[in-house]
């Protein structure tokens, strides 16, 4: 099956590698423009310069292209505790963050959140906190992993899936008594 | 097939609470976030709260901290919203949403929503 390409994908491809195709002279190839810059006016003619203008302040374009417009720059989301590493350039988007000792968790592809790594109390740490995963805790006995906090087996109730993780203290318990008996 | 049913709006006096359940069905529950989208009268969709599917992520506008509480019981396939010291301003068709793993639109499904009106 041959891939489906879109109008402007079809004409760019008639053009050698870093030009594309006059919008209204199919036999002139024009030069794309430089990231930073965007597309003002066509070439007029074969081996005449594209016109092509520097982004304006707020927005910017990340590679060659021939685009009436340059792409809006990102904004970091505040109320997701997002935090900017490096401010948008006229070739480079705003780079969005978490601080220090949180990561990256994305409701969606395009939108994260940042939390606070886990602390593993009254348990160990077996994986490190990482840019887009939260700490993984393994807990120590008596102790059942609930939302990646360790919680006592005292607050386990019978209906929750702790009982499994909580059943061998509860045993020990059983067995010390049974053998204190004898 | 996708279904979010709502229920659990009224009408409730300010400083009241109310508790929104969601069942969902036709999907792995288990796999998704899910949130809780409103629309006030004449306004624009507003995201109200989101929990993950599984671990302890939870986000909640501004407007709401403190006082709405998110929830889930996987074992049920219900997401609830715990609404209390409820305000004029909180009136709002309630939707319960699904939330996209990919694309750059979060939200991908939705329910019919449940009025809450809150009025002396």
């Known amino acids: 099956l041959v891939p489906h390409l879109g109008d402007r994908e079809k004409r760019d491809s008639v053009c050698p590698q870093g030009k594309y195709i006059h919008p209204q002279n199919n036999s002139i190839c024009c030069t794309k423009c430089h990231k930073g810059t965007y597309l003002y006016n066509d070439c007029p003619g074969p081996g005449q310069d594209t016109d092509c203008r520097e982004c304006e302040s707020g927005s910017f374009t990340a590679s060659e292209n021939h685009l009436r417009h340059c792409l809006s720059c990102s904004k970091c989301r505040k109320e997701m505790g997002q935090v900017e590493i490096s401010s948008c350039t006229v070739d480079r988007d705003t780079v969005c963050g978490c601080r220090k000792n949180q990561y990256r968790h994305y409701w969606s592809e395009n939108l994260f959140q940042c939390f606070n790594c886990s602390l593993c109390l009254n348990g160990t740490v077996h994986l490190s906190c990482q840019e887009k995963q939260n700490t993984v805790c393994t807990c120590h006995a008596g102790f059942f992993l609930r939302e990646n906090e360790c919680v006592s087996c005292s607050n386990c109730k019978k209906s929750l899936e702790c009982t499994k993780l909580c059943l061998p203290q509860i045993e020990n318990v059983k067995g010390t008594e049974d053998s204190g008996t004898t | 097939e996708v279904q979010l049913f709502e229920s659990g709006g009224g009408l409730v006096q300010p400083g009241g609470s109310l508790r929104l359940s969601c069942a969902a069905s036709?999907?792995?529950?288990?796999?998704?976030?899910m949130g809780w989208v409103r629309q006030a009268p004449g306004k624009g969709l507003e995201w109200v709260s989101m929990?993950?599917?599984?671990?302890?992520?939870?986000y909640y506008a501004d407007s709401v901290k403190g006082r709405f509480t998110i929830s889930r019981d996987n074992s049920k396939n219900t997401l609830y919203l715990q609404m209390n010291s409820l305000r004029a301003e909180d009136t709002a068709v309630y939707y319960c949403?699904?939330?996209?793993?990919?694309?750059?639109?979060?939200?991908?499904?939705w329910g019919r929503g449940t009025l809450v009106t809150v009025s002396s």
């Open positions: 949403a699904k939330i996209s793993q990919f694309g750059s639109n979060a939200l991908d499904y």
């Open positions: 929990i993950a599917h599984a671990g302890p992520e939870t």
């Open positions: 036709g999907f792995t529950f288990t796999r998704y976030s």
